[in-house]
């Protein structure tokens, strides 16, 4: 059951995993969410009544029966993981404490403007979990507009305490504002020889490589496959870390693979969700429960829905025994992953999918489309939305994207002459415009966000975000897609796409049926030699064949280029402007989204 | 069942004013546009403007933009006319129409507009 | 403004007959053109949508057709019931426009 709510003066009695130090009793549940074992916790808040050193300390719980008992005492605060509920978890905390010392070891020191240049530094550092600032009002001179950027082996203070005049504050790396590079690649036959900060067990180096992105002190990693020589060290997962934030040393070794934690692309890639199933293996750690089940997948979902479980073992029923059913053990560790894996004994494993929630949904996989043709298929481009005006008559005005599901991205230039977001309706999980009927569900737009820098298409900031009245429910024909990493500034897309109901030709009308094409990107210097009297700058991105013939065009404006990488589609490009549509030597200019995401989080974020 | 019942006739002086209504029931209101047009004797129709009664968002022909003026009274679902300077050429059937999802599809019975000194 | 031009005027068909009025729009309204018909004494009543489609309830003996610039509205066999105005209007841009109408006699 999911118990949102604070208990105030109430604490949970035993159960103790583990004690660590949080700014607030809110911060201290969502630390209590991304343990892989706390159910409970129980925070105290400063308090006269309260003896000063344990002010500030979060208890990690844990329990059997998913409860425990409640005791009244001043100051407490207790409540309960977000495990046990279906919403979106997000780590990013942008809250700044006042007056308060988070304590960890100080690395580094320097002179900044504001806290907020201070939080800037840190979420741009590879060490920097938290921070304090000295405010110009502190007391010692020497110590004013002093940056203390700080880490410590769980993310978390080793304690806190009050300081006049002083502010600390999380890294925003889990917000998706770290301008640190995102490198996505696992270098095979490589051990990085740094020092080991954990070791953990995982069948593929995937989920070594996720479960790096998640530990606090992990910059990268080194994983032992199931064929590495020694036998003790066989799936093992070593995480790592160096004063500089990169390996020192690269050793070539066969059977070894290593990378980087995918800290700065966490919010376009998923990180917590370990979807796929082993075959021929079992993991190894605490029994749970033995259920029988159909099938590994059946195993799977008896996993996710026991808030306890952290993985599982299937294995297949022998012939026509217990009516086809297998034994489905449900498992948890001290760390979430396995004691031990071990091969060749027909076992099929897996994770629990609740972590899924704790990942960006836009990282979900969509269906597989249909190469060539020009109709799109349902479902293919679940993000795609149809803009419609009433005014004068209701028509198709614009494409767009979900992004999150209160706000769709689409182009500024979309509005002109719309004078209330009120005669707008979004329509999702749309195919055909024909599908539309009077009494078609909609979303009706609360807000229209236009950058406040735009004046018209050609010269740049042609991005608008609407917020809708309701929330959109994700399903399989509508769910968002992410935005690009700022860390992947430098990736070549080479799978764009850009769809959209627009004209297939200058003078012609709105499609029906949504519409693809494959459009190759085009570099900026080369779109500025076709477009001589304009200013094509890096906030716009050009795409189009040299021939012509493929192209956006009137109607397509404010949707979405969208690229692949990784298995994940990511939102490149706003359709914007070009001359003409689909002509020779005249590729369609975008808004290039990368640019703008700071902007995009500003607002979809403020509060 | 969609209804839009119009005021009733009205007889004015040149220079004088009139506001006409449109009550609405059977559908949402304030989730549609309520158009005004007109229909001098003997002749076609004409366009006179539009209003969003959810937002007060308003459209003019510009022949009609100083004189008249579009409101809606969301809480008893009723749109509003008012033409001002009115003169001999405003005597007509006066109607309001809501603009469906593809067209105007429900009209009102019309109101009789006369000027006549 | 968007001109809508209609003919004829006025016309005169028996009964049986099928019968063609035509609008012809001063710039491209794509398909945002209806048709209304118009009995004496009555308000306008909606015939045809987006230029082809018939509208709730009304008989299938009335069509349209045309993108564009040009459209028409067809009677196929025309019945006593069908003498009144007929008028198109295009809803493409404001100012909202009508044709001057068409005038449907039986002979």
């Known amino acids: 059951e999911c118990v949102t709510q604070l208990l105030k003066d109430t604490c949970f009695e035993g159960g103790d995993i583990t004690t660590v130090f949080t700014p607030s009793a809110k911060y201290c549940q969502v630390v209590c969410t991304y343990h892989p074992r706390c159910l409970l916790f129980t925070f105290t808040a400063e308090s006269p009544s309260e003896d000063p050193t344990r002010w500030f300390t979060c208890v990690l719980k844990d329990s059997v029966t998913e409860t425990l008992p409640r005791v009244n005492r001043t100051a407490a605060i207790s409540g309960y993981s977000f495990k046990q509920c279906s919403h979106q978890i997000s780590a990013c905390n942008k809250d700044i404490y006042v007056d308060l010392d988070m304590k960890g070891i100080n690395y580094n020191s320097s002179v900044a403007k504001s806290a907020q240049e201070c939080q800037e530094r840190c979420t741009d550092d590879v060490h920097c979990h938290f921070f304090t600032y000295a405010t110009r009002q502190f007391p010692s001179l020497e110590h004013r507009n002093i940056c203390l950027l700080k880490h410590t082996q769980t993310g978390t203070p080793t304690r806190i305490t009050k300081l006049d005049k002083v502010v600390s504050g999380f890294s925003l790396k889990s917000c998706a504002l770290s301008n640190l590079a995102c490198i996505r690649d696992i270098f095979p036959n490589t051990v990085f020889a740094d020092s080991n900060i954990d070791s953990v067990m995982a069948p593929d180096a995937f989920v070594c490589g996720r479960i790096c992105t998640h530990h606090p002190g992990c910059l990268f990693f080194t994983f032992f496959s199931q064929e590495w020589p020694k036998e003790s060290q066989r799936n093992l997962c070593l995480l790592k870390t160096s004063e500089s934030g990169l390996p020192s040393t690269r050793i070539k070794k066969s059977k070894a693979l290593s990378g980087f934690s995918l800290q700065s692309c966490r919010h376009s890639i998923p990180v917590f969700c370990h979807s796929s199933f082993y075959h021929d293996t079992d993991f190894l750690g605490e029994e749970l429960d033995i259920v029988a089940a159909k099938s590994h997948e059946a195993c799977q979902k008896l996993c996710t829905n026991a808030v306890r479980c952290q993985f599982f073992t299937y294995t297949p029923a022998q012939a026509s025994c217990n009516e086809g059913k297998g034994k489905c053990y449900l498992k948890l560790s001290s760390n979430g992953s396995p004691t031990k894996i071990l091969h060749g004994r027909g076992g099929i494993s897996g994770y629990t999918l609740r972590l899924c929630k704790m990942d960006n949904e836009c990282t979900t996989k969509i269906k597989p489309r249909i190469v060539g043709g020009t109709a799109s298929v349902r479902g293919e481009w679940p993000w795609q939305v149809t803009l419609h005006t009433t005014s004068p008559t209701q028509r198709h005005l614009c494409g767009g994207s979900i992004i999150g599901n209160q706000w769709i991205l689409t182009a500024a230039h979309c509005f002109y002459g719309v004078e209330s977001p009120k005669i707008l309706r979004v329509y999702s999980g749309i195919l055909n415009q024909s599908e539309i009927k009077e009494d078609t569900s909609f979303f009706g737009v609360q807000e229209i966000i236009i950058h406040d820098q735009y004046k018209m298409a050609e010269s740049g900031y042609d991005i608008a975000l609407l917020k809708l009245e309701t929330t959109v429910n994700y399903t399989d024909s509508q769910r968002p897609i992410c935005l690009p990493s700022k860390g992947d500034r430098n990736v070549i897309y080479t799978d764009c796409w850009v769809t959209g109901w627009g004209y297939r030709k200058l003078r012609d009308k709105i499609q029906n049926t949504l519409q693809k094409a494959k459009i190759p990107l085009v570099t900026n210097e080369e779109c500025q030699k076709r477009y001589r009297g304009h200013k094509i700058t890096h906030k716009m991105i050009c795409a189009g064949y040299r021939e012509g013939g493929k192209d956006a065009c009137k109607g397509d404006s404010g949707g979405p280029l969208s690229c692949k990488h990784n298995e994940v589609w990511h939102l490149v490009g706003i359709t914007s402007w070009g001359e003409g549509c689909a002509q020779r030597e005249r590729p369609g200019v975008y808004t290039n989204v990368v640019e703008y995401v700071d902007w995009i989080l500003e607002k979809t974020q403020a509060v | 069942q969609v209804q839009l019942v119009q005021s009733g006739s009205e007889l004015k002086k040149p220079g004088a004013s009139v506001k006409l209504s449109c009550k609405a029931s059977g559908y949402t209101f304030t989730r549609y546009w309520m158009h005004w047009v007109r229909q001098a004797p003997g002749q076609g129709l004409e366009w006179i403007g539009n209003?969003?009664?959810?937002?007060?968002?308003?459209n003019y022909d510009e022949k009609f933009r100083t004189r008249v003026t579009l409101t809606a009274d969301t809480s008893t679902s009723t749109a509003y006319m008012e033409l001002s300077s009115l003169r001999s050429e405003d005597t007509a059937v006066y109607y309001c129409?809501?603009?469906?999802?593809?067209?105007?599809?429900?009209w009102g019975q019309g109101t009789t507009v006369t000027v006549s000194s | 403004d968007i001109v809508m031009t209609q003919s004829p005027s006025s016309l005169s068909a028996s009964v049986g007959d099928r019968v063609t009025i035509t609008c012809k729009a001063s710039e491209n309204v794509v398909t945002y053109v209806s048709w209304f018909q118009q009995k004496p004494g009555q308000a306008p009543k909606l015939l045809i949508y987006g230029a082809s489609n018939r509208y709730t309830g009304v008989p299938d003996r009335f069509s349209g057709s045309g993108s564009g610039t040009d459209f028409t509205l067809t009677i196929s066999s025309l019945q006593a019931e069908d003498v009144a105005d007929y008028h198109c209007g295009q809803s493409y841009s404001y100012p909202l426009t009508f044709g001057q109408g068409t005038k449907l006699e039986i002979k």
């Open positions: 209003i969003y009664p959810d937002s007060d968002s308003t």
């Open positions: 129409t809501r603009m469906g999802f593809y067209a105007m599809d429900y």
